[in-house]
Interface confidence: low
């Protein structure tokens, strides 16, 4: 029996890419490239966790370039199988020898783009309730090995208060962790810097986030409140709008009051601060009121809480559903208009 020299194949598995959003599509293709071997019979077998898979190998195609041949075989997997941590192997038998390459879903190294955010206290908590808190938010964690740790510190080295932690599973099966730290009103106003340090076994290094009082120019908000006119078909409901503009910095709290009572935040919808054409910021706030409310007392107050507002960090404007009644009242209380 004469033995002849042959060039053994190189076996490499390639994997189809994720979709545009970085998620796995419903099916994943694995491509086994068997390249650079002396032409001859080869057998390709796919294994799942070491077990031979019953797959159609008719898709395997062979090409020859010069003296060497290449073959490729494709395996289509469901997303479920790919995500289930199984190992897939392309096993090639050639000239009595076995060559193989294996692959599996990579561990989420970050995990999967974990992000951390640190908020400043709301002006309402800071100036009205006088119990400010800051929140460290960690999103997009896998519910996997090792707990995420959030630790607080102060740039001054002074001790921090006791924080409260909350963990929430999102619809997409990721984990969101928040840690809320009470801070001293005076410490915050005097410019203390607070740091949140996030550690997790899957993170290549700790994430650090810090927050402090915003520096830069200050400007008090201007507040304007309006009532929309009656609309056909909605006589028992009205929308009140409040424009708050030209304030700096952007931290602001908006409240609506009726009968001297603050309405729940869920009652109104307020935009995030947006930059004006100048150097300040503006927000819009929208409140729906019912006939029962305005017939009880037709005065609603839009209040902005902002550090530059004086004397008590608040600016407010009253608005009525039927402003013509206000005109009569004002005229009746003042001098006769003639």
């Amino acid at each position: 029996v004469c033995s002849r020299d042959f060039t053994p194949p190189t076996v490499k598995i390639l994997q189809s890419s994720c979709d545009g959003g970085g998620h796995f599509p419903p099916t994943i293709q694995l491509l086994c490239l068997v390249s650079g071997y002396t032409p001859g019979t080869i057998n390709i077998t796919w294994l799942e966790d070491g077990q031979v898979m019953d797959v159609d190998l008719s898709t395997a195609s062979t090409t020859q370039e010069g003296e060497l041949a290449s073959t490729q075989s494709e395996l289509t997997l469901s997303q479920k199988h790919w995500l289930s941590d199984r190992t897939y192997t392309c096993q090639v038998t050639y000239q009595g020898h076995t060559f193989e390459d294996s692959t599996k879903k990579c561990a989420d190294s970050n995990p999967r783009g974990v992000s951390a955010y640190l908020s400043r206290p709301s002006p309402f908590d800071l100036f009205i309730r006088k119990s400010p808190t800051i929140t460290c938010l960690v999103v997009d964690l896998a519910p996997s090995k090792g707990t995420v740790n959030l630790t607080w510190s102060r740039a001054s080295g002074k001790p921090v208060n006791h924080s409260t932690r909350k963990e929430e599973k999102q619809r997409n099966g990721t984990l969101t962790v928040t840690s809320t730290l009470p801070v001293g009103t005076r410490d915050w106003i005097e410019g203390e810097t607070y740091q949140c340090r996030v550690t997790h076994p899957h993170l290549p290094r700790a994430l650090m986030r810090s927050t402090t009082k915003t520096s830069g120019p200050r400007a008090a908000p201007e507040v304007y409140a309006f009532a929309t006119p009656e609309w056909p078909g909605s006589r028992d409901k009205r929308t009140l709008a409040c424009l708050i503009q030209n304030f700096m910095p952007e931290d602001i709290s908006v409240q609506w009051l009726h009968n001297e009572v603050q309405l729940p935040d869920a009652r109104h919808s307020t935009t995030q601060p947006r930059k004006t054409k100048g150097s300040g910021f503006f927000v819009f706030s929208r409140l729906e009121v019912t006939r029962a409310e305005w017939e009880q007392k037709d005065e609603f107050i839009c209040r902005a809480v902002h550090e530059a507002a004086s004397p008590s960090q608040t600016v407010q404007r009253a608005v009525s559903v039927n402003p013509e009644l206000d005109v009569c009242v004002e005229e009746a209380e003042g001098e006769a208009p003639w």
């Epitope: 995500l83 941590d85 896998a142 519910p143 996997s144 619809r171 997409n172 099966g173 984990l175």
Partner: antibody
């Protein structure tokens, strides 16, 4: 391969408690949420709640908040659900099911554990 | 809670028939571009088995005669040509909002 193997059937007296186990194998136990679902005789499926085995964090269907307690033991790759103050209405098959990471469906289920409450 | 109403509750069909089961949600189960609706098959004495996830994706190993469609509040599970092994109870499930809920089930029986 992924397997969820539950403890055997139980017969319990009203007022007592029972602890059902679900042993996971073939995957990284603490990389996935473990849920529990119940099915009363001849009835449909009801979601009870879940646990994150890593942190022990649990969420419950309000209906079962005072009935079920879900725990997990990472060292043995086992999830547990304890049912307290048993009543005849708690007679059902209880399933554990694994939720896929970043997805909201149950691809793998335990075989089910029948809990019968009878005096 | 989101209520899921399946119809019909039961149906009799023959091998080779095309079978359609609908599931209506009391509110939308779409969120941020994804649809949180799944379908399961359950045979007596067995655990449920995933058939369709995210409204229209066929789970691996599930025959292509099964298909799912829909978005928002209205969903359909279709079996294009009923086979003897398909006689079972089918459940829809929403996972858009806690508590996750299931439909009451549709029993497919032999005519």
């Amino acid at each position: 391969q992924v397997q969820l193997v539950q403890s055997g059937a139980e017969v319990k007296k009203p007022g007592s408690s029972v602890k059902v186990s679900c042993k996971a194998s073939g995957y990284t136990f603490n990389g996935y949420w473990m849920h529990w679902v119940r099915q009363a005789p001849g009835q449909g499926l009801e979601w009870i709640g879940y646990i994150n085995p890593t942190t022990g964090h649990t969420e419950y269907n309000q209906k079962f908040k005072d009935k079920a307690t879900i725990t997990a033991d990472e060292s043995t790759n086992t999830a547990y659900m304890e049912l307290s103050s048993l009543r005849s209405e708690d007679t059902a098959v209880y399933y554990c099911a694994r939720q896929e990471y970043r997805h909201s469906w149950f691809a793998y289920w335990g075989q089910g554990t029948l809990v019968t409450v009878s005096s | 809670d989101i209520q899921l109403t399946q119809s019909p509750s039961s149906l009799s069909a023959s091998v080779g028939d095309r079978v359609t089961i609908t599931c209506r949600a009391s509110q939308s189960v779409d969120y941020d571009g994804d649809t949180y609706m799944n379908w399961y098959q359950q045979k007596p004495g067995k655990a449920p088995k995933l058939l369709i996830y995210a409204a229209s994706n066929l789970d691996s190993g599930v025959p292509s005669r099964f298909s799912g469609s829909g978005s928002g509040t209205d969903f359909t599970l279709t079996i294009s040509s009923l086979q003897p092994e398909d006689f079972a109870t089918y459940y829809c499930q929403q996972t858009n909002e806690d508590p996750w809920t299931f439909g009451q089930g549709t029993k497919v029986e032999i005519k």
